[in-house]
Amino acid sequence: ECVTQLLKDTCFEGGDITTVFTPSAKYCQVVCTYHPRCLLFTFTAESPSEDPTRWFTCVLKDSVTETLPRVNRTAAISGYSFKQCSHQISACNKDIYVDLDMKGINYNSSVAKSAQECQERCTDDVHCHFFTYATRQFPSLEHRNICLLKHTQTGTPTRITKLDKVVSGFSLKSCALSNLACIRDIFPNTVFADSNIDSVMAPDAFVCGRICTHHPGCLFFTFFSQEWPKESQRNLCLLKTSESGLPSTRIKKSKALSGFSLQSCRHSIPVFCHSSFYHDTDFLGEELDIVAAKSHEACQKLCTNAVRCQFFTYTPAQASCNEGKGKCYLKLSSNGSPTKILHGRGGISGYTLRLCKMDNECTTKIKPRIVGGTASVRGEWPWQVTLHTTSPTQRHLCGGSIIGNQWILTAAHCFYGVESPKILRVYSGILNQSEIKEDTSFFGVQEIIIHDQYKMAESGYDIALLKLETTVNYTDSQRPICLPSKGDRNVIYTDCWVTGWGYRKLRDKIQNTLQKAKIPLVTNEECQKRYRGHKITHKMICAGYREGGKDACKGDSGGPLSCKHNEVWHLVGITSWGEGCAQRERPGVYTNVVEYVDWILEKTQAV
């Protein structure tokens, strides 16, 4: 059962796992949610009736029954983790805490103009978990405007105290706001020889990398595969760090794999969701339950639905015994990973999918798969929407992309002459324009947010957000696309597609069926040569064939240039402008979305 509200002046008795410090009950709830075992918590707020050493304590708790006895206690705030909830969860915390000093290891001290600058510094520093900033009014002259970057083993403060004229806050890495590089490569036959901060068991290097990503101290990892010569180290995932933030030594060793934390890419690839099945593999751990199940998929479902289950092993039925049902062992451990992994015993193992809701919805795999384009199939581009204007008659105006459950990203130039959002309708999950009838459901537009530097498409900033009047329920035919990570600026996308209902030649009509065309990206230098009269800025991205033939065209504006990278689709561009359509040496010009990620997040996350 999902309980989101906090219980004031209430303490849960017993069930303690560990105690951490958090600046608020709300953040205590987030920490509990991300902890592998925590189901309930009790937070102690600052209060004259409480011992100051207990202020800001966040006690993480577990219970076999998923609840604990309640006791009245002033200043105590209790609640449940969001593990029991089905909604999307984020660790992003943009709050600034006034007059609080969050203690940790102060490893960097520098002058900053503002708390915001200090927070940005923390976000772009690989080690930083949180910061404290002494304001201009701080009594000690030599400490004024000092920005202290801090880290701890747990990622949360070791203590929190009241201190006048300082502010504290957390790194915004989990808000996708870091400019740190996103290195997705896994290096085979490589061992990173740096200090281990922790070690866990993992079935493969990908799971090891994802565990490293959401471990607060892990910057890179080494994984020993099941073929590793030393038996006791097989399937061992070593979580590592270094002072520089990079591995100091790389040793060539067969059957080992190494890689980096994906913390700078976590909004565009799954980092919590381990969805694979591991055949002929047994996960050992504390047994929670043994249930009969028809298949390993059914066993995974049972584990996902049991809130305390972290991983499972399924043993298929022997011959016709037990109505063809096998045994499903639901398991857990102190850290969410198996205590041991065994091979060759015939089991099929995997993890709960409950953690998938901590990943961005946009990372969900979709069905496999304009000018010179071909017709799409239903559900192939579930983020693509058709934006209609109803004045004076209803018709398709532009494309757009779902990027959140209340947000469409599109082009600013689509709103030339549009005096009110009332005349706009957003249709999602549409393949053919002919599906749209008078009674077809649509999303009304509450607000049009145009970039305030936009003047005209050809000079850039051709980007706009539509805030919908109601939220989109994600399904196979309507779901969001990931924004590119800022750490992905150097990624070379090779699988890019433009989609839309636009014209197939310069003078044509809106197409009935959503068209798609695979189009290669063109460097900005090359693009600039083709548009000498224009300034192709770094905030634009171009795509097209030298010989022409395939391109976006009129009616495709605002729609996506979608690129697939590491099995996840990213919204790399927004269809904007170009000379003619599909002309030789005239690439299409798109808004370069990665350059607007901050703007998008600022607008969509505004309170």
Partner: antibody
């Protein structure tokens, strides 16, 4: 202020040539398609020619094809119309106009800015 | 070429009255149609683009409608300065064509 200023009109004999210019200011010239439209005395508007933003594509009315050449110099923000083999029926006020064509929404934006016109008289 | 035919050639109305001007294309021009106003001795001025969208600075009394082959320009309540010649123009074909114009005169 967005402005188009035509020049180069005048009196010319049949068979003669004339080069009209249109100086653009107050906007990014290279972003717009440009065109020439003429109006004979007491008559309606007649489209003459259009040119794409880069100058790579040109179109002409049948009545002037082979005799007139449209061109542009984006570095000088200027549109030209070279008129050869002029005839009496080419006598008109010649307007230059801009047209927004590079954006990829399906709307036709029309000729939203016009010059004041320059008069061409073809007479012996 | 796509022919554009405007009717009537002349329309006599009084200030405050409603004016309805018609334009017909010889084949579909989708919504690639614009309307222009030309006052005596002046350059044309864009009124309506894309068949039905009012250009910047054009009063709300001007409205356009239609799509395909039949288009209408409506002036809901004539003002003295509205008496002028009105042209429709298509750009669906790369050979642009104008209608012959409708002269709106004071009755």
């Amino acid at each position: 202020e967005v402005q188009l200023l035509e020049s180069g009109g005048g009196l010319v004999q049949p068979g003669g040539s004339l080069r009209l210019s249109c100086a653009a200011s107050g906007f990014t010239f290279s972003t717009y398609s440009m065109g020439w439209v003429r109006q004979a005395p007491g008559k309606g508007l007649e489209w003459v020619s259009s040119i794409s933003p880069s100058g790579g594509d040109t179109d002409y009315a049948d009545s002037v094809k082979g005799r007139f050449t449209i061109s542009r110099d984006n570095s000088k923000n200027t549109l030209y119309l070279q008129m050869n083999s002029l005839r009496a029926e080419d006598t008109a006020v010649y307007y230059c106009a801009r047209e927004r064509t590079m954006v990829r929404d399906p709307r036709y934006y029309g000729m939203d800015v016009w010059g004041q016109g320059t008069t061409v008289t073809v007479s012996s | 070429d796509i022919q554009m035919t405007q009717s009537p050639a002349t329309l006599s109305l009084s200030p405050g009255e409603r004016a309805t001007l018609s334009c017909r294309a010889s084949q579909s021009v989708s919504s690639y149609l614009a309307w222009y106003q030309q006052r005596l001795g002046q350059s044309p001025r864009l009124l309506i683009y894309d068949a039905s969208s009012r250009a910047t600075g054009i009063p709300a009394r001007f409205s356009g409608s239609g799509s395909g082959t039949d288009f209408t320009l409506t002036i809901s309540s004539l003002q003295p300065k509205d008496f002028a010649t009105y042209y429709c123009q298509q750009s669906y074909s790369n050979l642009v064509t104008f209608g012959q114009g409708t002269r709106l005169e004071i009755k």
